[in-house]
């Protein structure tokens, strides 16, 4: 009888074991284990009747198609074999064991005790057949195995071979190299590669196989395994295989498909080809006069580009448009995309206007072309070129006027300061005790009119100031302080300020320049109690044009000492000029007390100690600080007065030969202006030079050298 066994292990014993087995007995055990396993069989006890070639009693081990072993007896002889320590391994997952005893046994034989077990097959080691083994990597596990591929490869659906994904290769460059995957290593199996060369219409692709060409072939059948096919439109070239590369191929097309097929076997190195685009030839080119063509070639083909440029100082001119370079291209029909342009000399055109300056041409016919030269100069004597620049500009190759120092920036004409168009007389008669000023004597003098229209009725007052630049007026803070405040210092609104420059007679403002204020800046520390830091600035809405009657005064150097005692200074103003009119009379009578014509007076600086003493001796809280100085005469008779406030006290600087503002009319009193031993008190401007430059947004070095020279 037959016993079917399906367990992974088990025990088989002869009938009746451990007693002797019966005669004339036959049992077959069929052992089946899962795929991926084989069966290992061994005997722990074996005692059968001996016979020549095991003819009588035996144990036969076999598979479906082969006998693995036949055992009998109790020990091995030449003609009979016992299992002993031998292990029987089935090649597959099936093993059949047959026990047979004949009709007579001379002795008692105890039979056998056998054990079997399923053991794993290491397919990775044992498979030598290329058709079954893994292409790249093999991984064994209990009961089976699987294959995997190297990086960049994909396992084929046969779960054994490794292919590549190579069906999406697009080449658009005009030249290139295409190879089989992994070249020059053997190409992958089971792959379908597609390479597309897609160039612009007008190009023709030429192919050339290079180096190694090694594609699996067959001695009789043309390329049945692996091959290359080249598809040009509807036409197919190939298949190609073997070791001899095809001849160079001129496709006459801009679009080419290369198909490469490999089957699941073989070890061949593959192929490499280069492709090159060919196009129509364009006619020879001649460079323009004063120009060149790049790149310079003997021949030009479709898609070749040339850049036309001109010599230094010339510009490419195409259709009346100037440009630095011009590019033309060889078209697919073998013509150039454009005619060669011409080279035209660079023209810097009319130079920019210089504010407060003039232009003179150094080149004949007022030429403005490359290398022409011009010279800027300032409107002297009212303006001077900053940093003593030469003012010479040359027409550059870029088409801009260039100066060696300033580049393309225009020079700056700075107002000259402290140089009246009319020289001030050295002797001045005894705006109290003063005399009429001739027009142009004090070109920095400004009349500041403040009209506060925010109050009903309007508040209106005036003061003086000094022009520092085309845009800035220096004055006293108390002139520009809101008058309705008791102790707080608030500047008047800029809208309420009007500045008159070049004014001589207040009755005739027609010749004067009037300007509104863009900013009103009081010194942040101005003290209404003692008039300390009585200094302010007005920025004009627009810069004023300078001329004989409008010119700035110079600022002093930073000198804490201020002007030296007994130095003579001049001060001008439209204030009270009649020493016999008292303040009370002005108030009560309403008499017009402004002087029509600008008055000026020459006054000596009073030693600080003397001035302090003269004010300390009075009743009242008078304080002459280090930010003030005094001027006037002990005997009186000449002084500044009400309405002159903010005006410049100027001293002639011998070093620079210019007039410098050393003081601003600030305060005096309590007696009438011009009284005996009542000195006028002036803001010491030299203490505020840094503050002034800072507010004006100018570095001191810009203007300072004018005073120093």
């Amino acid at each position: 009888h037959t016993v079917e066994l399906n367990n992974m292990f088990g025990q088989i014993q002869s009938p009746g074991y451990p007693d002797s087995y019966p005669s004339d007995s036959e049992v077959t055990w069929n052992i089946t284990v899962p795929d991926g396993f084989r069966i290992k069989l061994y005997f722990m006890h074996f005692n059968l009747e001996s016979s020549y070639l095991c003819e009588y009693d035996y144990v036969k081990v076999e598979t479906e198609d082969q006998v693995l072993a036949t055992f009998c007896g109790r020990e091995t002889t030449d003609t009979e074999q016992t299992p002993g320590q031998e292990v029987v391994l089935s090649p597959g997952s099936f093993m059949s064991i047959t026990f047979r005893s004949d009709f007579s046994n001379e002795e008692r034989f105890t039979g056998f005790d056998a054990h079997y077990m399923a053991v794993d097959v290491d397919e990775c080691k044992e498979r030598e057949d290329e058709e079954l083994s893994c292409d790249h990597y093999c991984h064994n596990y209990i009961g089976g195995y699987y294959c995997s591929c190297r990086f960049g490869y994909i396992l084929h659906t046969d779960n054994r071979t490794c292919r590549v994904e190579c069906s999406d290769n697009l080449f658009t460059q005009r030249t290139g190299v295409i190879t089989s995957p992994d070249f020059p290593n053997p190409y992958p199996k089971s792959s379908e590669c597609l390479y597309t060369i897609e160039l612009e219409e007008g190009f023709m692709v030429n192919l050339q196989f290079e180096d190694i060409f090694d594609i699996e072939d067959h001695p009789e059948v043309p390329c049945p395994y692996d091959y290359i096919k080249i598809k040009v439109g509807p036409k197919v070239l190939g298949p190609f295989c073997g070791e001899k590369a095809p001849e160079p191929i001129s496709t006459q097309s801009h679009s080419v498909l290369i198909l490469f097929h490999s089957d699941n076997s073989g070890e061949n190195r593959g192929w490499r080809l280069s492709y090159r685009a060919a196009g129509n030839e364009c006619p020879e080119l001649q460079p323009p006069v004063h120009g060149k063509i790049e790149p310079s070639q003997a021949k030009y083909f479709f898609k070749d580009q040339v850049l036309v440029s001109c010599d230094t100082g010339y510009k490419v001119l195409k259709d009346n448009v100037e440009m630095d370079t011009f590019q033309i291209e060889c078209l697919k029909d073998g013509t150039w995309s454009n005619k060669i342009p011409t080279c035209k000399i660079v023209d810097c055109r009319a130079p920019g206007e210089l504010e407060h300056g003039l232009i003179t041409f150094s080149t004949r016919n007022n030429l403005t072309t490359y290398k022409s030269e011009i010279k800027y100069s300032c409107q002297e004597p009212y303006y001077k070129m900053l940093n003593n620049n030469t003012g010479i500009y040359t027409c550059s190759a870029q088409g801009v006027w260039m100066n060696k120092v300033l580049g393309r920036s225009l020079p700056t004409c700075l107002p000259e300061c402290g140089q009246p168009s009319r020289s001030l007389p050295s002797l001045v008669k005894r705006i109290i005790g003063g005399r009429n000023a001739e027009p142009g004597l004090f070109p920095w003098q400004a009349l500041i009119v403040v009209e506060d229209t925010s109050r009903v009725p309007n508040d209106k007052w005036f003061g003086s100031g000094a022009l520092l630049s085309a845009s800035w007026i220096l004055t006293a803070a108390h002139v520009l302080r809101s008058q309705r405040r008791d102790t707080t210092v608030i500047p008047v609104s800029k809208e309420h300020v009007t500045v008159y420059l070049g004014l001589h007679d207040v009755r005739d403002k027609s010749g004067a320049v009037n300007s509104s204020a863009a900013r009103v800046v009081l010194h942040p520390d101005f003290n209404i109690q003692n008039y300390n830091h009585d200094i302010a600035l007005v920025q004009l809405q627009e810069p004023v044009p300078l001329g004989p009657h409008v010119m700035p005064v110079c600022l002093p150097r930073l000198e804490p000492e201020g002007p030296a005692p007994h130095m003579l200074g001049l001060v001008a103003g439209w204030g009270i000029s009649n020493p016999n009119v008292t303040v009370d009379e002005i108030i009560s009578s309403g008499t017009r007390t402004l002087s029509d014509v600008l008055q000026y007076v020459k006054l000596p600086v009073v030693p600080h100690a003397e001035c302090k003493t003269s004010y300390e001796s009075r009743s009242g809280n008078y304080s002459v600080t280090e930010n003030m100085f005094c001027a006037g005469y002990y005997e009186g008779g000449k002084d500044t007065c009400l309405g002159d406030s903010g005006g410049a006290f100027v001293i002639f600087d011998d070093l620079s030969q210019r007039w410098v503002v050393q003081g601003l009319v600030s305060w005096g009193g309590p007696e009438e202006c011009g009284s005996k031993q009542v000195y006028g008190v002036y803001t010491k401007v030299s203490n505020y030079v840094d503050w002034v430059w800072e507010q004006m947004g100018l570095p001191q070095s810009v203007v300072e050298p004018q005073v120093e020279r």
């Epitope: 109050r455 009903v456 009725p457 508040d459 007052w461 002139v479 405040r485 008791d486 009400l642």
Partner: antibody, heavy 113, light 112 residues
Framework: EVQLQQSGAELVKPGASVKISCKAS????????IEWVKQRPGHGLEWIGE????????DYNERFKDKATFTADTSSNTAYMQLTSLTPDDSATYYC??????WGSGTTLTVSS | DIVLTQSPSSLAVSAGEKVTMTCKSS????????????LAWFQQKPGQSPKLLIY???TRESGVPDRFTGSGSGTDFTLTISSVQAEDLAVYYC????????FGGGTKLEIK
């Protein structure tokens, strides 16, 4: 015609706030100061402060700094005074004045529980 | 703050009489820059808003009868009504215009 038109009388409870308006017409509202003046029955005039509508600049009498707030709406030519934390002492007639010369008709405020 | 003291606090006169009232300031109200005294006089008739009569101590507001005259400078100021009319019955206030502005206590004018 140049005039200042004030909002009507107000009766409010102590602790509340009130906003009095003053609409200007006939002149450039932004360019002139608007003053506010308090008058209690049988008392004199007290200057509360002022606002320049164009710039929003304000000046306050120290006594009213925590009581009154001035604002101005230039699109409607209207000045406002808000009074907060009202007490019976705030009961009065409040005038708006165009920089001394032109007075509004006054707004009477009564603070009572 | 500047304090203004008005006197008398009230007075009664017959129509046609001349009236003088004063206003004293605790500080000088003359501004040397504008050459103005920042003092104004106002008239408040019963049940009405105050009305500007005089500004800058002595300048009469347009439309104000010339019987009203302001004078003075510095700290002492006077309002004079040369010939009182019945319609002049009112309280008269002085006001100084340095911030913070302040008013005097008022002078009440009654007609006999």
């Amino acid at each position: 015609e140049v005039q200042l038109q004030q909002s009507g009388a107000e009766l409010v409870k102590p602790g509340a706030s009130v906003k009095i308006s003053c609409k200007a017409s006939g002149y450039t509202f932004t360019g002139k100061w608007i003053e506010w003046v308090k008058q209690r029955p049988g008392h004199g005039l007290e200057w509360i402060g002022e606002i320049l509508p164009g710039s929003g600049s304000t000046d306050y009498n120290e006594r009213f700094k925590d009581k009154a707030t001035f604002t101005a709406d230039t699109s409607s030519n209207t000045a406002y005074m808000q009074l907060t934390s009202l007490t019976p002492d705030d009961s009065a007639t409040y005038y708006c004045v165009r920089s001394e010369d032109l007075w509004g008709s006054g707004t009477t405020l009564t603070v009572s529980s | 703050d500047i304090v203004l003291t008005q006197s008398p606090s009230s007075l009664a006169v017959s129509a046609g009489e001349k009236v003088t009232m004063t206003c004293k300031s605790s500080q000088n109200l003359f501004n040397s820059r504008t050459r103005k005294n920042y003092l104004a006089w106002f008239q408040q008739k019963p049940g009405q808003s105050p009305k500007l009569l005089i500004y800058w101590a002595s300048t009469r507001e347009s439309g104000v009868p010339d019987r009203f005259t302001g004078s003075g400078s510095g700290t002492d100021f006077t309002l004079t009504i040369s010939s009182v009319q019945a319609e002049d019955l009112a309280v008269y206030y002085c006001k100084q215009s340095y911030i913070p502005f302040t008013f005097g206590g008022g002078t009440k004018l009654e007609i006999k």
